[in-house]
Interface confidence: medium
């Protein structure tokens, strides 16, 4: 005869384990169903009743089949500086990330909690380590022999255009410029840039100098001025 | 380097004020994120209040709601604690720390409610 | 009462492999935020010493490690030194509380 099919609630042989999507209730000592993903255990099983599910209340959710009394609360709303990348449904949690131009500083497992304005280098600095979805832009001084005229997350330190002959020497912020109609040869045509991140947060290592010896990250940023740059004449 | 001087700290009997500041240098102040931490004689850290970068919002722990206010003068790079009806519990070294990771510390100022 | 909770004291041989638990809730560490923890030596101010569940500040020794898992985290400080008696704190932010939240605090003795 074809081994019975157990129906919930039911007490399991003695060192085998409850099937898929069921759980082993300690007080009941039954093996007892979960419930689904959206729902959550209203009423716990008993040795003659099995689990009792009811769907998430709005702003809850879970993932997973469960045995939850309560559902799990949805995040708090996407702010201005952020993209809801996923809804909160009874099923998921809500996801936010950064919008471009912004970093994670404070990063939850999915997604981000609060976001940051990538640093500007100010004229006199480039940039020496792009920001990411989770770090900050990092900025240098342009050492001799290169400039940056921008105030900019992008824009890195330039050579100086060579010049036949020099009217104006260069320095960090402003390029040579040159008493002949053109260069002999122009190592600058036009401005580097690095390429934006989505999102994310600081690194706290400083590989290279830096105006400001800490990165900035911070916490919920209402959409609002930009920050000051990040820059030679400092705080 | 990062450096933050708090200020303002003394004695104060419960129910008084006390005002404390912290000056910052050493980084863009006005783009950071800034929070005062305190800890009561022999005791744990405890977070007390985060200011925006632009001072548009701030968070408070429950125990100092409606009696303590966080500001900031970003043209003077000093971050404010503005503490009234002050009680015994809240003696403490108050530190004001930069960034969600509290990443930056100050020396702390002792404020002590007493009568 | 601290949210995040952590064995008040630990101690250690120098030399020695210490590790430091910290344990949080679903509105914390298992919201899925990161753990930071924060060294203080007697007399001064904390110091960040970990970030992000297991990132060093630079100047921060590879002695020191972090990790975390579900609702717990822990700070494992290997080849113990006598310089790193102090207290540990682990915090992480807390959604119900909107704010950053603090260990109790752990004392770690070297013997």
């Known amino acids: 005869l074809p081994a019975q099919v157990a129906f919930t609630p039911y007490a399991p042989e003695p060192g085998s384990t409850c099937r898929l999507r069921e759980y082993y209730d300690q007080t009941a000592q039954m093996c007892c169903s979960k419930c689904s993903p959206g729902q959550h255990a209203k009423v716990f099983c008993t040795k003659t009743s099995d689990t009792v599910c009811d769907s998430c209340e709005d702003s809850t959710y879970t993932q997973l089949w469960n045995w939850v009394p309560e559902c799990l609360s949805c995040g708090s709303r996407c702010s201005s500086d952020q993209v809801e990348t996923q809804a909160c449904t009874r099923e998921q949690n809500r996801i936010c990330t950064c919008r471009p131009g912004w970093y994670c500083a404070l990063s939850k497992q999915e997604g981000c909690r609060l976001c940051a304005p990538l640093r500007k280098c100010r004229p006199g600095f480039g940039v020496a380590r792009p920001g990411t979805e989770t770090s900050d832009v990092v900025c240098k001084p342009c050492a001799p022999g290169t400039f940056s005229n921008t105030t900019s997350s992008t824009d890195i330190c330039r050579p100086h255009q060579i010049c036949n002959v020099v009217a104006i020497p260069g320095n960090a912020s402003m390029d040579a410029v040159c008493t002949s109609t053109s260069p002999t040869r122009s190592m600058a045509p036009g401005a580097v840039h690095l390429p934006q991140p989505v999102s994310t947060r600081s690194q706290h290592t400083q590989p290279t100098p830096e105006p400001s010896t800490a990165p900035s990250t911070s916490f919920l940023l209402p959409m609002g001025p930009s920050p000051p740059a990040e820059g030679s004449t400092g705080d | 380097e990062v450096q933050l001087l708090e200020s303002g700290g003394g004695l104060v009997q419960p129910g008084g004020s006390l005002r404390l500041s912290c000056a910052a240098s050493?980084?863009?102040?006005?783009?950071?994120?800034m929070s005062w931490v305190r800890q009561a004689p022999g005791k744990g850290l405890e977070w007390v209040a985060l200011?925006?970068?632009?001072?548009?919002?701030?968070y408070y722990a429950d125990s100092v709601k409606g009696r303590f206010t966080i500001s900031r003068d970003n043209s003077k790079n000093t971050l404010y604690l503005q503490m009234n009806s002050l009680r015994a519990e809240d003696t403490a070294v108050y530190y004001c720390?930069?960034?969600?990771?509290?990443?930056?510390w100050g020396q702390g100022t002792l404020v002590t409610v007493s009568s | 009462q601290s949210v995040l909770t952590q064995p008040p004291s630990a101690s250690g041989t120098p030399g020695q492999r210490v590790t430091i638990s910290c344990t949080g809730r679903?509105?914390?560490?298992?919201?899925?935020?990161?753990v930071h923890w924060y060294q203080q030596l007697p007399g001064t101010a904390p110091k960040l010493l970990i970030y992000?569940?297991?990132k060093r500040p630079s100047g921060v020794p590879d002695r020191f490690s972090g990790s975390k898992s579900g609702t717990s985290a822990s700070l494992a400080i290997s080849g113990l030194r006598s310089e790193d008696e102090a207290d540990y704190y682990c915090?992480?932010?807390?959604?119900?509380?909107?704010?950053?939240?603090f260990g109790g605090g752990t004392k770690l003795t070297v013997l």
């Open positions: 720390a930069k960034d969600p990771l509290f990443d930056s």
């Open positions: 050493g980084f863009t102040f006005s783009s950071n994120y």
């Open positions: 200011i925006w970068y632009d001072g548009s919002n701030k």
């Open positions: 679903s509105s914390n560490i298992g919201a899925g935020y990161d």
């Open positions: 992000d569940n297991n």
């Open positions: 915090a992480a932010w807390d959604d119900s509380l909107n704010g950053p939240v």
